[in-house]
């Protein structure tokens, strides 16, 4: 039974606007038509789901309307963008990929991407 390797960058620095993007790439052992991608955040041994999307190969990645994630897919690569991040959101963001259909089912978990978020310094008041 083949394993499925998931690769993601080790470190990403969020922009000053609180946006972080990274690629989650999986080595598909089979010809999946339905794929589920989940992003989890691990901080202080606590794990929470950030967002998840199921998509059909060749179609757009669709997250829920209120999701902080957006993404696009291209072959076995998923380009993920997380928005609205603040310094307190710094943590390890884990990409989990599931090949849902057709059987057999495969699951792969990446090593995680450490996202660092630095809150921008407030602009100093100017005296005119």
């Amino acid at each position: 039974c083949k394993a499925m390797h998931v690769a993601q960058p080790a470190v990403v620095l969020a922009s000053s606007r609180g946006i972080a993007s990274f690629v989650c790439e999986y080595a598909s052992p089979g010809k999946a038509t339905e794929v589920r991608v989940t992003v989890l955040r691990q901080a202080d041994s606590q794990v929470t789901e950030v967002c998840a999307a199921t998509y059909m190969m060749g179609n757009e990645l669709t997250f829920l309307d209120d999701s902080i994630c957006t993404g696009t897919s291209s072959g076995n690569q998923v380009n993920l963008t997380i928005q609205g991040l603040r310094a307190m959101d710094t943590g390890l963001y884990i990409c989990k990929v599931e090949l849902m259909y057709p059987p057999p089912y495969y699951l792969g978990i990446g090593n995680g991407t450490q996202i660092y978020v630095i809150d921008p310094e407030p602009c100093p008041d100017s005296d005119f």
Partner: nanobody, 115 residues
Framework: EVQLVESGGGLIQPGGSLRLSCAAS????????MGWYRQAPGQGRDLVAH???????MYADSAKGRFTISRDNAKNTLYLQMNSLRPEDTAVYYC?????????WGQGTLVTVSS
């Protein structure tokens, strides 16, 4: 190195119940997924169910209703409660552990359902 040791298999009559266990040891990431697969004679290895360290559970259609997966995170131990067993449940049951960037298999435990 991670090790998985399954136990609890054996010969059981149709309609009976069995509880499988899988003890994991070694370097295990705090986020992980543990699951059960089974392989019937001459067949491929199929997912039965899996459960993540944060409690998320997934069952294959064939396991819904009769099988219950659970885990003890403190002991890194996985369980599979199997009820109303049928002859077609006869298989080698394998434990699998997914950690960050890797996955591991146990050696398997044989379950035989026969009268």
């Amino acid at each position: 190195e991670v090790q998985l040791v399954e136990s609890g298999g054996g010969l059981i009559q149709p309609g009976g119940s069995l509880r499988l266990s899988c003890a994991a040891s070694g370097s295990i990431s705090s986020y992980n997924v543990m699951g059960w697969y089974r392989q019937a004679p001459g067949q491929g290895r199929d997912l039965v169910a899996h459960i993540a360290s944060n409690g998320e559970i997934m069952y294959a259609d064939s396991a819904k209703g009769r099988f219950t997966i659970s885990r003890d995170n403190a002991k890194n131990t996985l369980y599979l409660q199997m009820n109303s067993l049928r002859p077609e449940d006869t298989a080698v049951y394998y434990c699998k552990l997914w950690v960050l960037g890797n996955d591991y298999w146990g050696q398997g435990t044989l379950v035989t359902v026969s009268s």
